[in-house]
């Protein structure tokens, strides 16, 4: 399923994605990518978490919520029109073919008031049409050893009617829930 979110040029965009850990600290690897979710992982990864921490991120992309409680919503700082497109949130639930993936569409609108000049983005993240070079940076860095016994009960993403980044604060009360197992 795909839900559309909006932000204005120069603002921060918010793309919600949640899961519920079985217990605090029993985290699940999550990746965010620019582009739709492929068969495995995320294409063009912009941020990753592992069982303990955020282990890979790129400029302007961060997690503003408490990811240790399952809030892995992505914040994109100071967006430009080039940030428009599909983003993949993939929750890599341990086991065989257990991943939950969400495609979220970000629409960037021109600013109503021209913002002050800001620093240009470091690279083009649009996938793959504006891609010019390929890197082999970290794809995933997860903790070794035995995996915690995670029995996820739900994964939440934003309900269809929540279309605007400013509604982020209402998310917890309005999220759609997917139950696993």
């Amino acid at each position: 399923s795909e839900v559309e979110y909006r932000a204005e040029v120069g603002q921060n965009a918010y793309l919600p994605c949640f899961y519920t850990p079985a217990a605090p600290g029993n985290l699940v690897p999550v990746c965010w990518g620019k582009g739709a979710c492929p068969v495995f992982e995320c294409g063009n990864v912009v941020l990753r978490t592992d069982e303990r921490d955020v282990n890979y991120w790129t400029s302007r992309y961060w997690l503003n919520g408490d990811f240790r409680k399952g809030d892995v919503s992505l914040t994109i700082e100071n967006v430009t029109l080039a940030d428009s497109g599909i983003y993949c949130c993939r929750i890599q639930i341990p086991g065989i073919m257990n991943d939950e993936k969400f495609n979220l569409k970000l629409v960037i609108k021109p600013a109503k008031v021209t913002p002050a000049p800001t620093r240009q983005r470091d690279f083009t993240a649009a996938f793959p049409r504006m891609l010019t070079t390929r890197g082999h940076g970290p794809a995933e860095t997860q903790t070794l050893g035995s995996l915690p016994d995670i029995n996820l009960t739900q994964i939440s993403t934003l309900a269809n009617e929540l279309r605007d980044s400013r509604l982020a604060n209402d998310l917890r009360d309005s999220g759609a829930t997917i139950r696993i197992g």
């Epitope: 699940v28 690897p29 582009g35 739709a36 492929p38 068969v39 495995f40 992982e41 294409g43 063009n44 990864v45 592992d50 069982e51 497109g85 599909i86 890599q92 639930i93 341990p94 086991g95 065989i96 073919m97 257990n98 991943d99 495609n103 569409k105 996938f127 793959p128 049409r129 891609l131 390929r134 890197g135 082999h136 940076g137 970290p138 794809a139 995933e140 860095t141 997860q142 903790t143 070794l144 995996l147």
Partner: antibody, heavy 118, light 111 residues
Amino acid sequence: DVQLVESGGGLVQPGGSRKLSCAASGFTFSSFGMNWVRQAPEKGLEWVAYISSGSSTIYYADTVKGRFTISRDNPKNTLFLQMTSLRSEDTAMYYCARWGRWADFDYWGQGTTLTVSS
Amino acid sequence: DIVLTQSPASLAVSLGQRATISCKASQSVDYDGDSYMNWYQQKPGQPPKLLIYAASNLESGIPARFSGSGSGTDFTLNIHPVEEEDAATYYCQQSNEDPPTFGGGTKLEIK
């Protein structure tokens, strides 16, 4: 340079078992998902299994589900494929392949040959 | 599963000319205009080698005479001008849906 070296192939009887290994070097093995892809003699390519970097997520092709097990040992930079209940149709060259940033198989080993025959 | 049908199964192209290989998917491998379609080259006795990723992006170190295009269900690999060393079998592969699948291959012979 990225290097993937498979081993463990050979002749196995139908119903038998075999464990393939893939030794990785030249990159941070623990940061990449890995795959096994096979190629029957004079045939095309068939994806077999995928494992995420931390082993949390695993996918199998329907043709091997329940018979093959993919695993990895990150400290030893090694990928494995445990194969059981082998059939003649499992006869193939088995390649390990790294899962790339852009949802592709970006590096491949030279392969190891498995022959299932009585 | 997404079935990828390559054509022709084999072709012979004169040195310096253009080789065109088609790959048709049984369903779209696009999502909002982004295509998870890749192309590989395999020479006898060697493993496959990634040439093109995401439909049209040239892998690092691959000569610019290789190019990919297409969207939806129809994709094309072009090689121009063809060189002797391009004699090989070429495979398309989709990463849009589980399981990842490959085309049947196209064998390129250089005349």
